[in-house]
């Protein structure tokens, strides 16, 4: 058994007061699929700004534009939803601001009443012009995939016309959709050609088809509903932290690990060590030493400070964070240079995040 155990009943033991972490929900920016979204990084005096999404570095691409302190997402999709962060790097320190992006078609419960154009969807025809059903507003039907957070209200619309006035019915997964198929039932607003489901749950996921018909014909349109579940998540670590560092023998160095967690996080700083000249025990497991962990007797656990370093301090340092949901870890390397060799500015080079995915 290794002389140093990574976790000996401490993995889940978070006692550090939560003031060090942004545990309260960050600001939420909402966009509908297809819309563009622009967010300004609300940090001052930023020399360099870096962006992450769900703890992973975010770079520019054909839909993501990064200009100064602005992030632009063009043609948003539900996949763009997540926890974003901008980090302002200054000459002496860095600061991170978190925000959520939610790309969804969800409406609030009252929104089904605000259809100012609803009456225009209900087209009255000259009684002589017999006509099979047709769509009157295809723009309102373009978004076929609706990804909606649980407990939100969903509205599907199929504005149609025809003569005589068509009737509308709804199918779920190709079968008649009955009120008893979901707790709380659903509403149909015939004059708005809409189906409304309040407080959606995971069992509401599926394909919803409106069938509009009269004696001259029938048309249909299918929407897909995905209910995005809402539950606490494991910790998220700021990408690129801790960062690689170098110093001379006798120097001091600091590693920083920035944590986002909506459940109280427990932080451990861990180093691979050697025993009897070996890095691994007889069972093949590495020897690991917990250098610091959050708790009553430890100061700011997000920072590991090493003073008067020796060559033996060189190596990989792991920031491991856990809550009762899960874990995340990232690591950085310390290079210790001989006294005569001045340290480079390697601290500005970030290590590749070592995710537990």
């Amino acid at each position: 058994r290794p002389s140093f155990s990574l976790v000996e009943d401490t993995t889940l033991e978070p006692e550090e007061p939560p003031t060090k972490y942004q545990i309260s929900q960050p600001e939420v920016y909402v966009a509908a699929p297809g819309e563009s979204l622009e967010v300004r990084c609300l940090l001052k005096d930023a020399a360099v700004i870096s962006w992450t999404k769900d703890g992973v570095h975010l770079g520019p691409n054909n839909r993501t534009v990064l200009i100064g302190e602005y992030l632009q997402i063009k043609g948003a999709t539900p996949r763009d939803s997540g926890l974003y962060a901008c980090t302002a790097s200054r000459t002496v320190d860095s600061e991170t601001w978190y925000f959520m992006v939610n790309v969804t078609d969800a409406i609030s419960s009252g929104d089904d009443e605000d259809d100012t154009d609803g009456a225009e969807d209900f087209v009255s025809e000259n009684s002589n012009n017999k006509r099979a059903p047709y769509w009157t507003n295809t723009e309102k039907m373009e978004k076929r995939l609706h990804a909606v957070p649980a407990a939100n209200t969903v509205k599907f619309r199929c504005p149609a016309g025809g003569n005589p006035m068509p009737t509308m019915r709804w199918l779920k997964n190709g079968k008649e959709f009955k009120q008893e198929h979901r707790i709380g039932g659903y509403k149909v607003r015939n004059q708005h050609w809409s189906l409304i489901m309040e407080s959606v749950v995971p069992s509401d996921k599926g394909n919803y088809t409106c069938v509009v018909e009269n004696e001259y014909g029938s048309i249909n349109h299918t929407y897909h509903l995905d209910v995005v579940e809402r539950s606490p998540h494991r910790p998220i670590l700021q990408a690129g932290l801790p960062a690689n560092a170098s110093t001379v023998v006798g120097g001091d160095v600091e590693f920083v690990c920035k944590v986002y967690s909506d459940a109280q996080p427990h932080i451990q700083w861990i180093k691979h060590v050697e025993k009897n000249g070996s890095k691994y025990g007889p069972d093949g497991l590495p020897y690991l030493k917990v250098l610091k962990h959050s708790g009553i007797n430890s100061s700011n656990a997000e920072v590991l400070a090493l003073f008067n370093v020796t060559e033996a301090d060189a190596g990989e340092y792991i920031c491991k964070v856990s809550n009762y949901i899960g874990q995340a870890n990232q690591s950085a390397w310390l290079t210790v240079l001989p006294k005569q060799q001045a340290p480079g500015r390697e601290k500005e080079i970030t290590a590749s995040p070592d995710y537990l995915e």
Epitope: L6, V7, D9, T11, L12, E13, P14, E15, P17, P18, I23, S231, P232, R234, D262, A263, Q264, S322, Y324, I325, G326, Q327, L356, E357
Partner: antibody, heavy 113, light 107 residues
């Protein structure tokens, strides 16, 4: 969707051991703690311990640390809870739970001579 | 270990009533508290996490409040399906202790 399916009821004699399984599906097994909770007949809930399947990290309630062993098999997405040296007060329903959000149906263990 | 004390241990109420259950921690647990509902012969169901956040698929008549040592679960208008036992749980530090439970019965 997320599912945790536990093994069936067990009847054991005092001093014996029991191994309860909890098979997970519908999510990335490695990424979430699996917790075990005991509920004796007519009693409340008691946390026994947890395991993180990705690396096997475990944490135990001191009351169960000596007799309970949690293991995970990532190849089958299954977690096991073994309880040794059984006594009558171990008669209970044992639940596994993914981060307390999703729960198994429970496994009844009866210890009787 | 952190002790969790729930009150009352049982209560009788009618459909439509507003019901409040309290939970007190023996020390500061910040917002690290979950609430569960359990019906006979069934596994517990997560209602509220992080003291105030409604879990998936939980009706909005349930709400949680409090931080530090004092917490409350409120059911704004009791429904027939809400008659059950409710537990609070410390999720700040191990062992993750539960309250003794509050049984909500039909008056």
């Amino acid at each position: 969707q997320v599912q945790l399916v536990q093994s069936g009821a067990e009847v054991k004699k005092p001093g014996a051991s029991v191994k309860v399984s909890c098979k997970a599906s519908g999510y990335i097994f490695r990424n979430y703690y699996i917790h075990w909770v005991k509920q004796a007949p007519g009693q409340g809930l008691e946390w026994m311990g947890a395991i993180y399947p990705d690396n096997g990290d475990t944490s135990y309630n001191q009351r169960f640390k000596v007799r309970a062993t949690l293991t995970a098999d990532t190849s089958t997405s299954t977690v096991y809870m073994e309880l040794s040296s059984l006594r009558s007060e171990d008669t209970a329903v044992y639940y596994c739970a993914r981060a307390f959000t999703y729960w198994g149906q429970g496994t009844t263990v009866t210890v009787s001579s | 270990d952190i002790q969790m004390t729930q009150s009352p241990s049982s209560l009788s109420a009618s459909v439509g009533d507003r019901v409040t259950i309290t939970c007190r921690a023996s020390e500061n647990i910040y917002g690290a508290l979950n609430w569960y509902q359990q019906k006979p012969g069934k596994a517990p169901k997560l209602l509220i996490y992080g003291a105030t956040n409604l879990a998936d698929g939980v009706p909005s008549r349930f709400s949680g409040s409090g931080s530090g040592t004092d917490f409350t679960l409120t059911i704004s208008s009791l429904q027939p399906e809400d008659f059950a036992t409710y537990y609070c749980q410390n999720v700040l530090s191990t062992p993750y202790t539960f309250g003794g439970g509050t049984k909500v019965e039909i008056k």
